[in-house]
Amino acid sequence: VPRWRQQWSGPGTTKRFPETVLARCVKYTEIHPEMRHVDCQSVWDAFKGAFISKHPCNITEEDYQPLMKLGTQTVPCNKILLWSRIKDLAHQFTQVQRDMFTLEDTLLGYLADDLTWCGEFNTSKINYQSCPDWRKDCSNNPVSVFWKTVSRRFAEAACDVVHVMLNGSRSKIFDKNSTFGSVEVHNLQPEKVQTLEAWVIHGGREDSRDLCQDPTIKELESIISKRNIQFSCKNIYRPDKFLQCVKNPEDSSCTSEI
């Protein structure tokens, strides 16, 4: 008799999930020699242990603690770049500005980036058919809880000036429901973080509006100020030129507004 399987609303576990996590871990330790003490088999075992045989709507941050411990990593606390709804540009930036880090530049973020995973209660199987959707099914699913956990820890580690890249093409440039808005903003430590500097990335070629005056940015400023952290905001009118100038700061065209 075929076992009844829960149908969730979201896509199933990414194919080759175990192989991908293990391969990513090994790659990461190859290109980041300071992390070569990490045992990738133990990392995979801890990752698996966080969600296998557990109901995929009943995952807690506690489930991920063994993995968090194994993936403990020190990044320069004053070189952190947060982002919201503009991941690709943030990653292009840290690829050029090598001394700055997004969450996905750390081992745990790198391992899970763009992957989906979930298991089933009481069976050791990985569910490749479907996984819970955050909105339609439940928020305490393996993927959401993972990102909430690592994002909180990443924000807690930040100090001095923290940068955040925001997508100026979205209707809500700052979204309270994003991971940045719901987790990271609230876990910046006022005793360590002096300033949050937002970079609002413009999408249109001829868009010369000051998006730092957007109501959602004012809302972000209010939240941050109430937490005794200073706030500053910059418009990045030309993201392509911005990246080019990060690459070649001495270029004569890089002295003007970007």
Partner: antibody, heavy 123, light 112 residues
Framework: QMQLVQSGAEVKKTGSSVKVSCKAS????????MHWVRQAPGQALEWMGW????????DYAQKFQDRVTITADRSMSTAYMELSSLRSEDTAMYYC????????????????WGQGTLVTVSS | DIVMTQTPLSLSVTPGQPASISCQSS???????????LNWYLQKPGQPPQLLIY???TRAAGVPDRFSGSGSGTDFTLKISRVEAEDVGVYYC?????????FGQGTKLEIK
């Protein structure tokens, strides 16, 4: 079996660019970092840079930073190394290489190499 | 960058006799994980290099047991217990403790 097959020999003029390809087979291309190493005639080996084919992220040796670009085409399981502003000193054999994985640990040694691509730069 | 220095730059050995190549690094290659990131390669004429030894003393797959690697944090030795005709070529040591990975200048082994 695991293979890295490189493009053929090239003769280039000073100041031009060259793009060397390295086609991988026998393994999942995105699971491994690809490195590029060169060797000028009668000289030692010199590491140029790496690419993570899954993400497209790269890192280059300081010496080549301004002139080298390493890319990857996941659909073709192929890595590319482009060197610009060629000078006579760039005449060399160019190799792609990757490590072996020993029980879920990168060995730290280049266990697999392409056959090499000879690039000759003439004025 | 870590500098790798090999000695001798060439040696000529009678078949069946032992051979020894030294390599010195400008910094210790011992990682906190207990592994020493020193590799040895042999490059035969007209071929790409082939990995002989990694982690200072672990033989790569298919490498005959007449090849052995030893050393400490900065001083390393590749030994061939009994040289055979097929061992001719240039031997390179390489550090992979940190980026950029760097190679020694090579030691050419000839048969007498």
């Amino acid at each position: 079996q695991m293979q890295l097959v490189q493009s053929g020999a090239e003769v280039k003029k000073t100041g031009s660019s060259v793009k060397v390809s390295c086609k991988a087979s026998g393994y999942t291309f995105t699971d491994y970092i690809m490195h590029w190493v060169r060797q000028a005639p009668g000289q030692a080996l010199e590491w140029m840079g790496w690419i993570d084919p899954e993400y497209g992220s790269t890192d280059y040796a300081q010496k080549f930073q301004d002139r080298v670009t390493i890319t990857a085409d996941r659909s073709m399981s192929t890595a590319y190394m482009e060197l610009s502003s060629l000078r006579s000193e760039d005449t060399a054999m160019y190799y792609c290489a990757r490590v072996a994985i020993i029980t879920t640990v990168a060995s730290g040694g280049f266990a697999y190499w392409g056959q090499g691509t000879l690039v000759t730069v003439s004025s | 960058d870590i500098v790798m220095t090999q000695t001798p730059l060439s040696l000529s050995v009678t078949p069946g006799q032992p051979a020894s190549i030294s390599c010195q690094s400008s910094e210790s290659l011992l990682h906190s994980n207990g592994k020493t990131y020193l590799n040895w390669y042999l490059q035969k004429p007209g071929q790409p290099p082939q990995l002989l030894i990694y982690w200072m003393s672990t033989r790569a797959a298919g490498v005959p047991d007449r090849f052995s690697g030893s050393g400490s944090g900065t001083d390393f030795t590749l030994k061939i217990s009994r040289v055979e005709a097929e061992d001719v070529g240039v031997y390179y040591c390489q550090q992979f403790l940190e980026y950029p990975p760097t190679f020694g200048q090579g030691t050419k082994l000839e048969i007498k």
